[in-house]
């Protein structure tokens, strides 16, 4: 029985060239988190394994930094980074929990971290 809930940073915007922290938090469950996968638009960005630590996909290692915590920091943002990001928590015994974050990378200085806009 999955009793937990994933809280995410939701819909966020950031400036081109800047950086952003993607964060998910699993609450309301005593399940053990064995691994967290971060995926961007069908591509694996990074894995944080409880035993083995962090692995960043080679194609993203120059622009992705682990943390804080189980979150992920994206750097040197481009407009092509606009899109959906998924945090996938693998837990025992509950199974997997999925959170979705939508990032919009803006050309101008209008962007505000955490600014909300119409889904997605």
């Amino acid at each position: 029985m999955m009793t937990g809930t994933i809280e995410t940073t939701g819909n966020i915007s950031a400036e081109k060239g800047g950086s952003i922290i993607l964060q998910c938090h699993l609450s309301s469950t005593t399940a053990q988190v064995t691994q967290v996968n971060w995926e961007q638009q069908d591509q694996l960005l990074a894995i944080c394994n409880a035993d083995l630590g962090w692995h960043i996909s080679p194609s993203f290692k120059d622009r992705v930094a682990p943390g804080p915590g189980l979150g992920l920091t994206l750097q040197s943002l481009t407009v092509n980074d606009t899109g959906e990001y998924f945090c996938i928590y693998h837990t025992y015994p509950d199974g997997t929990y999925t959170g979705r974050i939508f990032l919009e990378v803006l050309e101008s200085s209008v962007a505000e971290h955490g600014a909300r806009f119409q889904i997605p």
């Epitope: 995926e39 638009q41 069908d42 606009t82 899109g83 959906e84 939508f102 919009e104 806009f117 119409q118 997605p120």
Partner: nanobody, 116 residues
Framework: EVQLVESGGGLVQAGGSLRLSCAAS????????MGWFRQAPGKEREWVSS????????YYADSVKGRFTISADNAKNTVYLQMNSLKPEDTAVYYC?????????WGQGTQVTVSS
């Protein structure tokens, strides 16, 4: 710009099933991913599921995982959402959209009502 039209909604009893369709006016292969979203009365629109057209990867909100299945038929330029074991809390207007596009005009959607 690809136009999307949702259909397949209706009134169903709790525990029942529905299959929603999202027909595109052009080729969905020009869109990297498609998603289903829903909006219940008095609530914010929320993401339900996404499918990646080429890779085939699928993602689901925890509230529908194991009950809903998203799929894409490239030949028919249509995306589907098979909804099983429906619950009253699934009652909402369902919309499909390019899930990687930040802003757009929403279509009319299709109403799904689940009675207890």
């Amino acid at each position: 710009e690809v136009q999307l039209v949702e259909s397949g909604g209706g009134l169903v009893q709790a525990g029942g099933s529905l299959r929603l369709s999202c027909a595109a006016s052009g080729s969905i292969t020009s869109i990297r991913s498609m998603g289903w979203f829903r909006q219940a009365p008095g609530k914010e629109r929320e993401w339900v599921s996404s499918v990646y057209i080429f890779g085939g990867s699928t993602y689901y909100a925890d509230s529908v995982k194991g009950r809903f299945t998203i799929s894409a038929d490239n030949a028919k330029n249509t995306v589907y959402l098979q909804m099983n074991s429906l619950k009253p809390e699934d009652t909402a207007v369902y919309y499909c959209a390019n899930s990687n596009k930040p802003k757009f005009d929403w279509g009319q959607g299709t109403q799904v009502t689940v009675s207890s």
